[in-house]
């Protein structure tokens, strides 16, 4: 006779990430047995939602129920339909909702209602869709990472489950880098954090954590380029903008009204005798750098050490994950290696600005235009972010390990969000039974 | 102090157009979303059209779809109110008003008013 | 559009009474209606927003409840000064004005 298979007494977990340029669907799965062990949750789906951040849709919120339709459908095939019922969905929106909300929080209400609505006529249980804040952002990204790396075991191992572990209990800053926002979020060596709202207390497995974490709005790679292409503008003498951040031969016509529609760039409006401006890439990697720099006010620092725009930054500490756009953007680079110093990161980026955008979209040509143009962009936008902004150097250089996966599952706030509101992480260690670490084995 | 100056009213015809501007002085003009209401002679208040601070967002009344355009310039602080087709039904006083702010959001309920503009469409 | 509905059209009070004001809305609004008071001649003037939240320089006289589909203004006490026209609003939808509701004093 056949065997047949026992049932896998497993759960699911369902996250939309509603970022500022498009929704991700993660979903998570775990042993129900082991809930409150360290890394035994894994994500076995991620699904792109067609179209952009939910954002968008504040002038068609009508459009929202079939954007996600595609998605939600994904997760009830991988979900077997005995588990429907019981799988907790959440939806996290963030920086392009906060940047809505700024705009009218009734706004902002609106998309959120009717996101609930449309995710509310699902199998699932539906948990609620909310705008996360920039320090629960930051917090679960390095909830998320420490929890892979299995910062959070007590156990010492004697064999490393993933390549970045170093094999001792010192957590891994998190950097995370969106459209609309940056995050950065580490345990500061015996600092203390100056400012209160910069400042997160966790009880984990029984261990105590003082986390620092910001978040800041605005300087995502997206919003970053809006902010510079406000602040270079103003200075062009005529509707032709010479931009050192594109390839050489690049153009571009951008509309006024486009540039000025987000509350990032109201710093730089103004009135200008034209509708509309092109860029023209010139790819130089040094002027792009001194444009960027410019968009960081370090002048002023009511602290012992700041960031930039006055926000106080503790000295880093220990190895960092830099995840997300960190990661996409230099994995198209070909710059994630840990092999690879900072100087030399900076000389293929010198290298790869200057090249003709001709050359360019030869090389590339399975890659839209519209993301490939703006590599040269957002690769020396992270250089300037991680050097001048958060003060790393060409020696810290080595302590960032540019993450895209860690045991399969994305690297990203969502996996410490579903931790947090399914309380899988506890305050306490759980009691150790002798099975507790065989997914170890 | 905040204030709101409304101009452009006037008589004129059924189907003719008429601009409408609102003068803001007081606060930072592009921080804060702008809107036209109008009132009917005798008659309650009726909202008109909305501009948000960073024009994600722009909308009419049904009765005035259309035939009506809000613009804003914000180097000038101002707003404006492009009728065109107008009809005897579009006789009112109209109020340049601000969007209030919830602490850190905005809102979109009225925080400041202007003293208002005449526009009577009559033949 | 959300249609919004007040009572009583007008009503007379008597100096330091109460006088209350209720407005419905013909689906929920959240906690978004404000308020507003209009004297003869004058633009309106923003009392209460968010539904209970008292607009900057206006008496602690005024006050404002509800959410959903039901709200009200409450004046305790009433002073000859508070005679003029009120107005609900709701901004959960393109925004809509009540009819209006004639306050005087007696």
């Known amino acids: 006779t056949q065997n047949k298979a026992l049932p896998e007494n497993v759960k699911y977990g369902i996250v939309l990430d509603a970022g500022s340029s498009h929704t991700s669907l993660y979903i998570y799965k775990w042993p129900a047995e082991k809930e409150n062990d360290t890394g035994v949750v894994h994500q076995v789906e991620e699904c792109r939602v067609k179209g952009p951040g939910i954002s968008k849709f504040v002038q068609k919120v009508n459009e929202i129920g079939i954007y996600l339709t595609d998605c939600m459908e994904r997760a009830r095939e991988v979900i077997p339909r005995s588990q429907h019922q019981e799988t907790p969905v959440y939806l996290g929106a963030t920086a392009g909702m906060r940047l809505l909300r700024m705009e009218s929080e009734e706004l902002a209400d609106r998309v959120l209602d009717v996101v609930e609505r449309s995710l509310s006529n699902y199998p699932f249980d539906f948990q609620g869709a909310r705008i996360i804040t920039g320090q629960e952002e930051g917090a679960y990204g390095w909830i998320t990472i420490n929890y892979l790396l299995g910062k959070f075991s007590q156990k010492t191992r004697w064999f490393s489950i993933v390549p970045y572990e170093t094999n001792n209990q010192e957590t891994f800053g998190a950097l995370d880098l969106g459209g609309a926002s940056t995050q950065v979020t580490f345990v500061p060596q015996n600092q203390t954090i100056e400012s209160p709202d910069n400042a997160l207390q966790f009880r984990l497995y029984g261990k105590d954590y003082n986390v620092y974490t910001h978040s800041f709005l605005c300087y995502g790679k997206d919003q970053a380029l809006w902010q510079k292409l406000a602040k270079d503008i103003q200075v062009a003498s005529n509707e032709i903008l010479r931009d050192p951040c594109f390839h050489p031969g690049y153009k571009k016509v951008v509309n006024v009204s486009d540039l000025y529609k987000t509350p990032c760039t109201k710093r730089f409006e103004m009135t200008l005798p034209f509708q509309q401006f092109e860029i023209q890439g010139i790819g130089n990697y040094q002027q792009c750098h001194q444009s960027i720099l410019e968009l960081f006010n370090t002048s002023y620092c009511p602290y012992s050490q700041c960031a930039f725009n006055g926000i106080f930054l503790p000295p880093l500490q220990g190895d960092f994950g830099a995840f997300s756009a960190f990661y996409f953007v230099m994995k198209f680079l070909n710059l994630t290696s840990e092999k690879v110093s900072q100087e030399k990161v900076t000389e293929m980026m010198k290298k790869f600005c200057a090249q003709p955008w001709e050359e360019i979209k030869t090389s590339y040509a399975g890659v839209k235009e519209k993301y490939l143009s703006e590599y040269c962009f957002s690769g020396t936008y992270i250089l300037s972010l991680l050097l001048q902004g958060y003060h790393f150097t060409a020696d810290s250089w080595e302590h960032i390990h540019f993450i895209g996966k860690i045991q399969g599952s994305d690297a990203g706030w969502t996996l410490g969000y579903m931790l947090n509101l399914t309380n899988m992480i506890p305050a306490e260690q759980p009691l150790s039974t002798p099975l507790s670490h065989s997914t170890y084995v | 102090e905040v204030q709101l100056v409304e101009s452009g009213g006037g008589l004129v015809q059924p189907g003719r157009s008429l601009r409408l501007s609102c003068a803001a002085s007081?606060?930072?003009?592009?921080?804060?979303?702008m809107n036209w209401v109008r009132q009917a002679p005798g008659k309650g208040l009726e909202w008109v059209s909305s501009?948000?601070?960073?024009?994600?967002?722009?909308s009419y009344a049904d009765t005035v779809k259309g035939r009506f355009t809000i613009s804003r310039d914000n180097a000038k602080n101002s707003l404006y109110l492009q009728m065109n087709s107008l009809r005897a039904e579009d006789t009112a006083l109209y109020y340049c008003a601000r969007h209030g702010r919830y602490g850190g959001y905005g809102g979109f309920y009225f925080d400041y008013w202007g003293q208002g503009t005449m526009v009577t469409v009559s033949s | 559009d959300t249609v919004l509905t007040q009572s009583p059209a007008s009503l007379a009070v008597s100096p330091g009474q109460r006088a209350t004001i209720t407005c419905r809305a013909s689906e929920g609004v959240k906690s978004y209606m404000h308020w507003y008071q209009q004297k003869p001649g004058q633009p309106p003037k923003l009392l209460i927003y968010k539904a209970s939240n008292l607009a900057s320089g206006v008496p602690a006289r005024f006050s404002g409840s509800g959410s959903g589909t039901d709200f009200t203004l409450t004046i305790n006490p009433v002073e000859a000064d508070d005679t003029a026209n009120y107005y609900c609003?709701?901004?959960?939808?393109?925004?809509?004005f009540g009819q209006g509701t004639k306050l005087e004093i007696k």
């Open positions: 501009f948000s601070s960073s024009s994600t967002y722009i």
């Open positions: 007081g606060f930072t003009f592009n921080n804060y979303g």
């Open positions: 609003q709701q901004s959960w939808n393109d925004p809509t």
